[in-house]
Interface confidence: medium
C-alpha cells in the first residue's frame, strides 16, 4: 500500500514520517545546532537503527545532536535522553564533547568547536 | 511551509515527490531490475543533481538502471532515454554493459551478471 | 564577570537606518560555543527576538525584521552591531544586547543583559 | 512562529500570597521555556530554566514546572520585592519569542 510521508519542511528528505535534511555548509557544532533550531528541527538524534535504516548509507560525517556530559560522564542528545546502549559504535577520532555521525552506526568523537557538516532532523 | 511527500510504497524514502528504496540483498542486474518491477519501481534512474541531491551522500555501489546499449554506444536508462551529459562521471571499473550508481553522481561500470545491493525508485 | 553596554544614537528619523553597536567586556566575543542576541522591548509588541551571531559572522534573524536587518561583529574590537533599516515609528523601542545561558550544549534564555537603550524615531 | 499566551496579564495581590501565573504555547517545547522578572527600567532578569531549573541566586519561593504546552510560574509567598512583571520566552525554535507579560502589582 502507498502512503505521504511527513509533513516536512520544503526538500526535506521524510522517512517512517521523520523529516530528515543533509546540510553542506560546515559549522561548529553550536552553529548546526542553531541552523536545525531556525528550521524548526534539532540535530539528528539516533533513536532507532530499525526506524532509521536510510543513516547506514549516509557517506562521511556529520554532526548530530549527541554531547559529553562531563559532569556525570553520560553522552546525550539535545533534549536530554541518554545515548542508548549499542545503538552507536562512539569511536575516540579527537578529544571532544561533540559527536560526528558516520555510516553504519557510527559516532565519532570530536572537538565541538571543529567545523563539519551536519544532519537535520525534526520528528512528525 | 511543510508539506507531505509521496505518495510512496510503505516504508520508502521520499524526497521532492520521489520514492527510494536501498536493497540490502545482492542481485545481478536483471534479478535488481525484476525485484523493483515486482514493486511497482524501476531501478534509480538519474535526472536531475538538484532534484536527486540526495544521491550524492550515499555511499557503496548499487545498480541503477543505466544500460550500455553495444550497437550504438550510447548508455541509457530502461524506459529508453538517454543518459544527459553531464550527469553522471561514468569509470569503468569493470568491462560490461551494466552500471553502478556511487556516491556524488559516479556510475561504475559492471557486468550485468555480478551481485550488488541496488536502488529502486518510484516517481510519483 | 561579562557584561555588555548598547551605544548608538537615541533619535533615528523615519526611512534612516538605526545603528547600534554593543562592546562586550570581561570576556571574549570569539569564544565558538557563544552567540550574541539583539532583543528590543515596545510598548506595543513586548520583547522581541531580532536576531543573533557568532563570532564566526554566521547569522539567525527573525523572519519579521530579516529583509531589514544585519548583525555584524568584529572580533578585533569585542563588539557586535545591528543595523536596521528603513525604520518607522514602530521600530520605536528600548534596545538590548545579550547572552544566552549555554549549559550542557543548550541555550536556556538569556542571562546576560545591556542596559538597554532607548531609540526613538521621529522626524 | 510559535506563540506564548500569558495568564492572567494582570495580577493585584498581597505579600505574603501565593502567586501562579500560567503561560501557553501555540505547539509543544519540551522544557525549553524561560521565566524573567522585570522591574521598571531595567533589563529583564533570567529566573527560570529550562522550565524547572532555578537559576543561582534566584529566592527558592519561585519555583517553575509544565512541559509541552502548560507551564507555570509559581512564587510561594510574595515579597515586597517581587512586584514586577514576568515574560515567559520559548527556546524550542527560532524565532525565540516572548509572552506579552504579566504584570504583578500591590493589592
Known amino acids: 500500500t502507498e502512503s505521504y510521508c511527513g509533513p516536512c519542511p520544503k526538500n526535506w528528505i521524510c522517512y517512517k514520517n521523520n523529516c530528515y535534511q543533509f546540510f553542506d555548509e560546515s559549522k561548529n557544532w553550536y552553529e548546526s545546532q542553531a541552523s536545525c533550531m531556525s528550521q524548526n528541527a534539532s540535530l539528528l538524534k539516533v533513536y532507532s537503527k530499525e526506524d532509521q535504516d536510510l543513516l547506514k548509507l549516509v557517506k562521511s560525517y556529520h554532526w548530530m545532536g549527541l554531547v559529553h556530559i562531563p559532569t556525570n560522564g553520560s553522552w546525550q542528545w539535545e533534549d536530554g535522553s541518554i545515548l542508548s546502549p549499542n545503538l552507536l559504535t562512539i569511536i575516540e577520532m579527537q578529544k571532544g564533547d561533540c559527536a560526528l555521525y558516520a555510516s553504519s552506526f557510527k559516532g565519532y568523537i570530536e572537538n565541538c568547536s571543529t567545523p563539519n557538516t551536519y544532519i537535520c532532523m525534526q520528528r512528525t | 511551509t511543510e508539506s507531505y511527500c509521496g505518495p510512496c510504497p510503505k516504508n520508502w524514502i521520499c524526497y521532492k515527490n520521489n520514492c527510494y528504496q536501498f536493497f540490502d540483498e545482492s542481485k545481478n542486474w536483471y534479478e535488481s531490475q525484476a525485484s523493483c518491477m515486482s514493486q511497482n519501481a524501476s531501478l534509480l534512474k538519474v535526472y536531475s543533481k538538484e532534484d536527486q541531491d540526495l544521491l550524492k551522500l550515499v555511499k557503496s555501489y548499487h545498480w541503477m538502471g543505466l544500460v550500455h546499449i553495444p550497437t550504438n554506444g550510447s548508455w541509457q536508462w530502461e524506459d529508453g532515454s538517454i543518459l544527459s551529459p553531464n550527469l553522471l562521471t561514468i569509470i569503468e571499473m569493470q568491462k560490461g554493459d551494466c552500471a553502478l550508481y556511487a556516491s556524488s553522481f559516479k556510475g561504475y561500470i559492471e557486468n550485468c551478471s555480478t551481485p550488488n545491493t541496488y536502488i529502486c525508485m518510484q516517481r510519483t | 564577570q561579562l557584561q555588555l553596554q548598547e551605544s548608538g544614537p537615541g533619535l533615528v528619523k523615519p526611512s534612516e537606518t538605526l545603528s547600534l553597536t554593543c562592546t562586550v567586556s570581561g570576556g571574549s566575543i570569539s569564544s565558538s560555543s557563544y552567540y550574541w542576541v539583539w532583543i528590543r522591548q515596545s510598548p506595543g509588541k513586548g520583547l522581541e527576538w531580532i536576531g543573533n551571531?557568532?563570532?564566526?559572522?554566521?547569522?539567525h534573524y527573525n523572519p519579521s525584521l530579516k529583509s531589514r536587518v544585519i548583525i555584524s561583529v568584529d572580533t578585533s574590537k569585542n563588539q557586535f552591531s545591528l543595523k536596521l533599516k528603513s525604520v518607522t515609528a514602530a521600530d520605536t523601542a528600548v534596545y538590548y544586547c545579550?547572552?544566552?545561558?549555554?549549559?550542557?550544549?543548550?541555550?536556556?534564555?538569556?542571562?546576560?543583559w545591556g542596559q538597554g537603550t532607548t531609540v526613538t524615531v521621529s522626524s | 512562529d510559535i506563540q506564548l499566551t500569558p495568564s492572567p496579564s494582570f495580577l493585584s495581590a498581597s505579600v505574603g500570597d501565593r502567586v501562579t501565573i500560567t503561560c501557553r504555547a501555540s505547539q509543544a517545547i519540551s522544557s525549553y521555556l524561560a521565566w524573567y522578572q522585570q522591574k521598571p527600567g531595567k533589563a529583564p532578569k533570567l529566573l527560570i530554566s529550562?522550565?524547572?531549573t532555578l537559576q543561582s541566586g534566584v529566592p527558592s519561593r519561585f519555583s517553575g514546572s509544565g512541559s509541552g504546552t502548560e507551564f507555570t510560574l509559581t512564587i510561594s509567598s510574595l515579597q515586597p520585592e517581587d512586584f514586577a512583571t514576568y515574560f515567559c520566552?520559548?527556546?524550542?525554535?527560532?524565532?525565540?519569542?516572548f509572552g506579552q507579560g504579566t504584570k504583578v502589582e500591590i493589592k
Open positions: 520566552q520559548q527556546l524550542n525554535s527560532f524565532p525565540w519569542t
Open positions: 545579550a547572552k544566552p545561558l549555554l549549559r550542557d550544549y543548550y541555550y536556556y534564555g538569556v542571562d546576560v
Open positions: 551571531i557568532y563570532s564566526s559572522g554566521s547569522t
Open positions: 529550562p522550565a524547572s
